[in-house]
């Protein structure tokens, strides 16, 4: 297979960082990280025709180059630029779904509504989803023992900077009506400190984006409140309006029914509010 060829050609030896080295507060690099990234890249480029010409070896070289031999608290967006370039992807800019604290439902939605895309439906998001990685300064080793935690250690760590960079680019590429799925069960439905609140909101381009439409997902079956009136949603509306982008909001009272109606829109029960 293509993957075996890549590993044969490289003959990489990924040593674990010895246990006596610096211990960070977060979990270490995901087991078999290089193999996982390469396997995901090969799988993705086989499935998505517009990315078929992408060379997964070059993608891995660029990914590796972003954090190997670098201090894991001193990573910059520039470190990821080569990877971002190789992973440049033209998704329909009016079919973008952002999400905050409700990843699973957002992904279930785009699995059904195939013409819409979350960040994790793009090559770069797919490569890194649910993975952790870091290296250490001046050695070519991957640290499988521990990696910096965003709060306890440092914010400029390989994983956080990756998601900040790729999220910014994803938001910058959006146009027309952009949707965002928000978790109505959380105390802060819109959180200014989330990736959506701190990165994506501020990188939507007003000259391209007409409207941000929030979908507030209710948690309880009997919850009939209008969560679009929540103070944090009003805060989001204020931020968006100041950026000359229109804002709209919808309550999704029954997420299970919502997904069912996306699958079968002609179902008679799908005309009522969901």
């Amino acid at each position: 297979s293509g993957l075996n060829d890549i590993f044969e050609a490289q003959k990489i030896e990924w040593h674990e960082v010895p246990r006596w080295r610096q211990q960070w507060s977060g979990p270490g690099t995901t087991k078999r990280f290089p193999e996982t990234v390469l396997a995901r890249c090969v799988k993705y480029t086989e499935i998505h025709p517009e990315m078929r010409h992408v060379d997964c070896q070059s993608v891995w070289d660029a990914f590796k180059g972003a954090f190997i031999s670098k201090h894991p608290c001193n990573i910059t967006e520039e470190d990821y630029q080569p990877l971002m370039k190789l992973g440049t992807q033209t998704v329909p800019c009016n079919k973008i779904l952002l999400w905050s604290r409700i990843k699973d439902l957002a992904h279930q939605f785009t699995q059904v509504q195939r013409d819409m895309f979350t960040l994790e439906d793009t090559l770069l998001g797919y490569l890194a989803d649910d993975l952790t990685w870091c290296g250490e300064f001046n050695t070519s080793k991957i640290n499988y023992q521990s990696c910096p935690d965003w709060r306890k250690d440092c914010s400029n760590n390989p994983v956080s900077v990756f998601w900040k960079t790729v999220s910014r680019r994803f938001a910058e590429a959006a146009c027309d009506v952009v949707h965002v799925m928000l978790n109505g069960s959380r105390s802060k439905i819109f959180d200014k400190n989330s990736t959506f609140g701190s990165v994506e909101v501020h990188n939507l381009q007003p000259e391209k984006v007409q409207t941000l439409e929030a979908w507030v997902i209710h948690g309880g079956r009997e919850d009939s409140r209008d969560l679009c009136q929540d103070p944090t949603i009003k805060e989001l509306e204020s931020i968006i309006s100041k950026r000359n982008i229109q804002f709209s909001c919808k309550n999704i009272y029954r997420p299970d029914k919502f997904l069912q109606c996306v699958k079968n829109p002609e179902d008679s029960s799908c005309t009522s509010e969901i």
Epitope: G65, E77, M84
Partner: antibody, heavy 121, light 110 residues
């Protein structure tokens, strides 16, 4: 002053090889992608390959160039190379190197070009 | 393969005329606006005029303007000057960091 200077072009037999050079001066080499672009006589522009070397070399190619063309870089000489093998008559063109600033607002276009070197097969 | 189609291929104009060149891409460019325009004179390398569809490159006169998004773009010269007679190319940026150029539009003196 930013300068890109190509060399190494000339007449080569079909099936032959040639190595082009692109010498850079007046800017920090490592902050830029260097892109090879060619132009057949009286025709339009066509991109060939790209390379960036912040730490290790990261390179990629137009589909048609994969396998026959190889891009490389010598940071100590501020020079990028394009090795062209199994050359064909349709590879006859002026070959330009151009720079693209590494940074998301700037990527995707070429703000400085060399004067080009002619390859005749 | 991505095709960028420029029209017209040749355009005759007089000094002071308003000139418009169209560029159509077979696929949407990255970010809906990642398209550049270049000017090339005989025996010279291309020179960047516009980037991201509507941004003027450094040192380019304001008589040049660009517009469009997605797959359709235009370059306009509001009042053609003697120095503007040249060939113009559009260039798109696409998935995987790939590039494509249009076939060119030659603007010649009427």
């Amino acid at each position: 002053e930013v300068q890109l200077l190509e060399s190494g072009g000339g007449l080569v037999q079909p099936g032959g090889s040639l190595r082009l050079s692109c010498a850079a001066s007046g800017f920090s080499f490592n902050n830029y992608w260097i892109i090879w672009i060619r132009q057949a006589p009286g025709k339009g522009l066509e991109w060939v390959a790209a390379i960036y070397s912040p730490s290790g070399d990261i390179k990629y190619y137009a589909d048609w160039a994969k396998g026959r063309f190889t891009v490389s870089k010598d940071n100590s000489k501020n020079t990028v190379y394009l090795q062209m093998n199994s050359l064909r008559a349709e590879d006859t063109a002026v070959y330009y190197c151009a720079r693209e600033l590494a940074g998301s607002s700037y990527e995707g276009y070429f703000e400085s070009w060399g004067q080009g070197t002619l390859v005749t097969v | 393969d991505i095709q960028l189609t420029q029209s017209p291929s040749t355009l005759s104009a007089s000094v002071g005329d308003r000139v418009t060149i169209t560029c159509r891409s077979s696929q949407s460019v990255y970010g809906h606006n990642w398209l550049a325009w270049y000017q090339q004179k005989p025996g010279k390398a291309p020179k960047l005029l516009m980037y991201r569809a509507s941004n003027l490159a450094s040192g380019v006169p304001s008589r040049f303007s660009g517009s469009g998004s997605g797959t359709e773009f235009t370059l306009t010269i509001s009042s053609v000057q003697p120095d503007d007679f040249a060939t113009y190319y559009c260039q798109g940026y696409y998935s995987g960091g790939s590039y494509a150029f249009g076939g060119g539009t030659k603007v010649e003196i009427k």
